[in-house]
Interface confidence: low
């Protein structure tokens, strides 16, 4: 997170830290005791699927305070439409090997109903993004969990206000822009997969996933987030279905 | 709708403006007051737009030049007071007033619903947690706010 602040311990209780072979991989969001939402691109280069760990209740990576809960990732489900190395359909649903125990420091973020997300949450201007990613473009990653308040843009406004880059990916209907184009604040590498959380009448909801951008906090560019509302039914259907074998699964979308 | 104007100076008004066409200046002479002249002139020059009683559901009408304004009773709204305010209680309008989820129903009022781990209160719009750790709440902040002294 560039230009954010430390999320006080326990105030981002749905934040997940994903590790592979003990190394920091990505962020994620707990949506109930056994399921985590993250970004598909986080898993493009994974070879040791059985060494994926999700950590809940984490705050400061440099110390163990007893509130952390680690779980093996039993399954990573990615939409069939996602192509590794690209930006569209950048979402993954992770099944934990064992459920986490909900505590003051481990709480799920609500996965909203689609219509509510599209016609109400999408019009809440500011939302929080969080993670242990880089504090500057090409800089060091954070030890303490960072959080940033970002305004959401309509895609048309995002395109109009963004500097044109030749090979820049399209902003599709499965994404949205949020943040600042003045180079001051943005999510960054290492935050990928983490939550874009929107507050409405006392409750927080998952509205986006940290996905991609032109560098981090680059002048003339906004952060791009996976539009979770497009995947609500897909996620719910998968969470209801019988477990399928295999760590990495491609599930038909839509 | 504007009969009160005719009570002001019946003789002059009949003579100058009803029997033959009068000008704004002649009307001004009759009423001696700019505001009253204007009210009369709006109705006189382009007809009384309130004559057809366009305001429904007990609304009162005010004539305007080529137009009119309805003043509605509290339960109604719309150009002609034709819409019952409850009919505007639909999900696209401020989430239908619901705290969480909203469902529209044809012929009946919208209904509010709550996420798993919450239940709907008697007011029909608010949600209250039914589990210790409902989604989307931050326990540390909830407890901090609950322990704050309450104003009296």
């Amino acid at each position: 997170i560039v230009g954010g602040k430390v999320c006080p311990k326990g105030e981002c209780p749905w934040q997940v830290l994903l590790l592979v072979n003990g190394a920091q991989l990505c962020g994620g969001t707990l949506i109930n005791t056994i399921w985590v939402v993250s970004a598909a691109h986080c898993f493009d280069k994974i070879k040791n699927w059985r060494n994926l760990i999700a950590v809940l209740g984490e705050h400061d990576l440099s110390e163990h305070d007893g509130d952390e809960q680690s779980r093996r990732v039993a399954q990573v489900i990615i939409p069939s439409t996602y192509v590794p190395g690209t930006t569209n359909h950048d979402i993954a649903l992770l099944r934990l090997h064992q459920p986490v125990v909900l505590t003051d420091h481990v709480v799920p973020l609500c996965l909203p109903e689609r219509t509510f997300s599209e016609r109400t949450l999408a019009f809440v201007r500011f939302s929080l993004v969080s993670g242990w990613g880089q504090l500057l473009d090409r800089g060091a990653t954070a030890l303490e969990l960072m959080v940033l308040n970002v305004p959401r843009l309509m895609t048309q406004d995002c395109l109009q206000q963004s500097r044109k880059v030749g090979d820049s990916p399209n902003i599709t209907e499965y994404m949205f822009c949020a943040g600042y184009s003045d180079g001051s604040k943005d999510s960054c590498k290492g935050d990928s997969g983490g939550p874009h959380a929107t507050h409405y009448r006392g409750t927080w909801y998952l509205t986006g996933i940290v996905s991609w951008g032109q560098g981090c906090a680059t002048v003339g560019h906004f952060g791009v987030y996976t539009r979770v509302s497009q995947y609500i039914e897909w996620l719910q259907k998968l969470m209801r279905s019988e477990p399928r074998p295999g760590v990495l699964l491609r599930a038909p979308f839509p | 709708a504007n009969a009160f104007l005719e009570e002001l100076r019946p003789g002059s008004l009949e003579r100058e403006c009803k029997e033959e066409q009068c000008s704004f200046e002649e009307a001004r002479e009759i009423f001696k007051d700019a505001e009253r002249t204007k009210l009369f002139w709006i109705s006189y020059s382009d007809g009384d737009q309130c004559a057809s009683s366009p305001c429904q559901n007990g609304g009162s009408c005010k004539d305007q030049l080529q137009s009119y304004i309805c003043f509605c009773l509290p339960a109604f709204e719309g150009r002609n007071c034709e819409t019952h305010k409850d009919d505007q209680l639909i999900c696209v309008n401020e989430n239908g007033g619901c705290e969480q989820y909203c469902s529209d129903h044809t012929g009946t009022k919208r209904s509010c619903r709550c996420h798993e781990g919450y239940s709907l209160l008697a007011d029909g719009v608010s949600c209250t947690p039914t589990v210790e750790y409902p989604c989307g709440k931050i326990p540390i902040l909830e407890k901090r706010n609950a322990s704050k002294p309450q104003g009296r």
């Epitope: 059985r50 069939s80 295999g246 760590v247 491609r250 | -």
Partner: antibody, heavy 122, light 107 residues
Framework: QVQLQESGPGLVKPSQTLSLTCTVS?????????WSWIRQPPGKGLEWIGY???????NYNPSLKSRVTISVDTSKNQFSLKLSSVTAADTAVYYC???????????????WGQGTSVTVSS | EIVLTQSPATLSLSPGERATLSCRAS??????LHWYQQKPGQAPRLLIK???QPATGIPARFSGSGSGTDFTLTISSLEPEDFAVYYC?????????FGQGTKLEIK
């Protein structure tokens, strides 16, 4: 390089149990993947019999389910097929196979044994 | 179960020609369709996975397309070694099923 090799009797009497073993080399059977059995009657198409996943879970073709058992012996890096109450209709070339572990659930079969011919006859 | 119907049953072409093989699913299977080539006395070989992704080591003349219920395997310019039987496979839901095959023979 992953290699699979089927072994077992080439002739089985009707009503008996057909038993085949697949030995996997160049890859640990317990590390991932679905390990399948597929058969092909003479001059006909391919029929999926079932698989065992590295975790031990199995999935069988409903048309054969009542007669099929697939098991794994991780110590020998082998998995086996047992098909009971065989008839002449079970005469086929039997292939053992490993599904491509690109994304696990679609069972694109990237590795095959060379096949073993089994005839059911008295 | 998902039934895959391949057409034509037999396709007679000459080397250098373009071959187009069709596979139709009885219900939508997204892109969960794979293509195999089988030569006499040999095990099948995976050509295309997920409708359009070439398997490792497959020549560029083989390509796949389609999604949902209609799928096509195209061989842009036939080589002598391409004459074989081609099968499509449903990888979408159990039981896993194969098409009945298309035999590609030399004209």
């Amino acid at each position: 390089q992953v290699q699979l090799q089927e072994s077992g009797p080439g002739l089985v009497k009707p009503s008996q149990t057909l038993s085949l073993t697949c030995t996997v080399s160049g890859y640990s059977i317990s590390s991932d993947s679905a390990w399948s059995w597929i058969r092909q009657p003479p001059g006909k198409g391919l029929e999926w019999i079932g698989y065992i996943y590295y975790s031990g879970s199995t999935n069988y073709n409903p048309s054969l389910k009542s007669r099929v058992t697939i098991s794994v012996d991780t110590s020998k890096n082998q998995f086996s097929l047992k098909l009971s109450s065989v008839t002449a209709a079970d005469t086929a070339v039997y292939y053992c196979a490993r599904s491509v572990n690109y994304y696990g659930n679609s069972f694109a079969v990237g590795y095959w044994g060379q096949g073993t011919s089994v005839t059911v006859s008295s | 179960e998902i039934v895959l119907t391949q057409s034509p049953a037999t396709l007679s072409l000459s080397p250098g020609e373009r071959a187009t093989l069709s596979c139709r699913a009885s219900q939508g299977i997204s892109d969960y369709l794979h293509w195999y080539q089988q030569k006499p006395g040999q095990a099948p070989r995976l050509l295309i996975k997920y409708a359009s992704q070439p398997a490792t080591g497959i020549p560029a003349r083989f390509s796949g397309s389609g999604s949902g219920t209609d799928f096509t395997l195209t061989i842009s310019s036939l080589e002598p070694e391409d004459f074989a039987v081609y099968y499509c496979q449903n990888g979408h839901s159990f039981p896993l099923t194969f098409g009945q095959g298309t035999k590609l023979e030399i004209k």
